[in-house]
């Protein structure tokens, strides 16, 4: 008799793919634009990325450092009207893109949470949650929670409001902290909270270090759902050299949890290449005319248009990974097992029951390496075959679909491999 199928876990929409942050509407849309009506016109692009949710804003009225002039129920007229927002919500729903609203109160000011008036601000947030839930948003984000006194209890209260309205609503909290203990203490009292942090931001050094960070995090958080990013708001290029961007895309899309990206991560948008542009929100490079301040700074291969036409581009890789992440059971909710593959490498298996399984091997180093995959580290339920088919490599030149002998696996510098193999009883 065939073995019984394992029961599928309950899956929320944010479990099924990536979230895409647009923290600065004006920078995202470019010169002379930057409103909700314009963003509506970019939803097809978001659909092409196969992202499941858009984390938007903040877009509320906020006069820098002035609580009285901060209204979480009102959209800043520079971004548009409530009607524009409703229209954006409707269009996004039609395209199966959920909208998460950032309600970080004092986003234009020095302290995001007006440190001296915590209770006033907390009440404003509570009212805002109820108002925007009624308006149809799918969730909320609050950032810089390390600046919020008694963050855990406030988050628990806001989580109750959000989940009380519907189990299908999400609360995301962001912190600049990279300290695991601080992160765990925030998670402890908030069961379904999705937390973005700087935990992985210094992981770029070696495969061993990244492996230990990831496994420590997963062990510490047990069976709760995680999110993966390098920070609560910033671009990957703020932390990574260009040669590691592909590797990190592959990793973030294949770890167990929700990958969270900032606009521009899909093309390797880098503020440092655009003199004068703010590190936290450089202008999005749609095409070569997107940065007219210094035209010579932008070449076609840095833009959405140029990369869309190149199957070997970072954007093309992002789209492929996003597609795989949203349709393969083993990547959607499969078990995770990291194992040794040799110095400089990080490797793991994702598997779910009798579904197709995935092997990820990442070379963080700047020299080519032979992978010594230590299958003995793996439980019987996740054993390695002799060969696996190459689904994709982060580097050009490999023949996709071809079977690779796992004992003879060699990786180029900064190369990541995604391999697939069938379940074997």
């Amino acid at each position: 008799r065939a073995p019984r199928c394992r029961e599928l876990p309950a899956q929320k929409w944010w479990h099924t793919g990536a979230l895409y942050r647009i923290g600065d509407l004006q920078a995202f849309q470019g010169h002379g634009a930057g409103n909700l009506a314009g963003l509506k016109g970019r939803l097809d692009y978001l659909s092409s990325l196969k992202v499941k949710g858009l984390v938007l804003g903040p877009i509320h009225k906020n006069q820098k450092d002035d609580v009285a002039q901060t209204d979480l129920l009102q959209i800043d007229p520079n971004f548009g009207s409530k009607e524009d927002f409703d229209s954006l919500l409707q269009s996004a729903k039609k395209k199966s893109i959920r909208v998460i609203l950032d309600l970080t109160p004092n986003y234009r000011g020095e302290n995001s949470w007006f440190s001296t008036q915590v209770d006033t601000v907390a009440t404003k947030v509570k009212d805002a949650l109820e108002f925007w839930l009624q308006a149809g948003v799918d969730g909320f984000q609050v950032r810089d929670i390390e600046n919020l006194k008694d963050a855990s209890s406030f988050l628990a209260e806001w989580q109750n409001i959000t989940k009380g309205f519907s189990e299908d609503r999400l609360l995301i909290a962001g912190t600049n902290s990279s300290d695991l203990q601080q992160i765990l203490s925030l998670l402890e009292s908030n069961k379904d909270l999705l937390l973005t942090s700087s935990y992985l931001s210094d992981s770029g050094s070696t495969g061993e270090h990244t492996k230990s960070l990831v496994t420590q995090y997963l062990n510490a958080t047990g069976n709760r759902w995680c999110s993966w990013s390098l920070s609560q708001a910033r671009l990957l290029t703020s932390f990574l050299p260009a040669q590691l961007l592909r590797l990190y895309q592959l990793m973030l899309f294949t770890l167990p949890g929700t990958p969270v990206f900032s606009y521009g991560d899909e093309i390797g948008l880098d503020a440092a290449a655009l003199p004068g542009q703010p590190m936290e929100a450089p202008v999005m490079l749609w095409d070569e005319s997107s940065f007219p301040d210094i035209p010579g700074a932008v070449s076609a291969n840095m833009t959405v248009k140029g990369q869309s036409e190149d199957p070997g581009s970072l954007l093309s890789l992002f789209r492929r990974l996003s597609d795989q992440r949203s349709k393969e059971r083993s990547l959607l909710h499969g078990d995770f097992h990291a194992f040794s593959a040799g110095p400089g490498l990080f490797s793991y298996i994702r598997h779910w029951d009798q579904n197709e399984r995935f092997l990820v091997v990442l070379n963080f180093g700047d020299v080519g390496l032979s992978a010594g995959l230590q299958a003995s580290d793996l439980p019987a339920s996740a054993s390695l075959p002799a060969k696996a088919d190459l689904l994709l490599s982060t580097q050009p030149g490999r023949e996709e679909g071809s079977p690779l002998e796992l004992e003879r696996l060699k990786l180029e510098p900064h190369e990541g491999l995604l391999l697939r193999f069938p379940y074997a009883a």
Epitope: H31, G276, Q277, M279, P292, P295
Partner: antibody, heavy 125, light 113 residues
Amino acid sequence: QVQLVQSGAEVKKPGASVKVSCKASGYTFTSYYMHWVRQAPGQGLEWMGIINPSGGSTSYAQKFQGRVTMTRDTSTSTVYMELSSLRSEDTAVYYCARGYYDILTGSRPIFFDIWGQGTMVTVSS
Amino acid sequence: DIVMTQSPDSLAVSLGERATINCKSSQSVLYSSNNKNYLAWYQQKPGQPPKLLIYWASTRESGVPDRFSGSGSGTDFTLTISSLQAEDVAVYYCQQYYNTPITFGQGTRLEIK
């Protein structure tokens, strides 16, 4: 009126560092990018880099990478340029210069509508 | 880097006469998306900082006398002073802002004949 006022002349030994300040007044400090341009005695103009006073992001000419640091203090509307590991070839007048800003389009092309009076830095043993 | 070359290095012109300074860039500074030339001209008098005269190759900065005009496109540009005045004695620089590093011409010294 709009003006940029720079700190006074400096004499430094080779290997030392110099920090030049530039105080802006008469306009919204964070709305305009600031640049540093130097001019060696009897020579032409040489662009060193840019700072965005709003967020503090910087971009330096390759030639000065690793030796120059541009910072700003929004509370006093002042930008600073520090040049380290000085050598005799760094003897020059150092200017801060405000980048143009088109309020209508929001564009900031890099030409300079307001200049500081200049700071003479002499590097000599 | 874009190299800017001015000619002549120095120029002597009689009062009331026309003065012409040329500037050539090593690559085009015309941006096809907005059809603008990313070129500026400055005047620098002894002991003073440079002063902006012209930007976008031909737009005069406010307060600059209309005897100053700029022309040209692509790689070849000209600054013209239609009728030289005594106060125009200075060094003139062209500058490209099409790409970083921002670069200047070596300067043209203008004197009275």
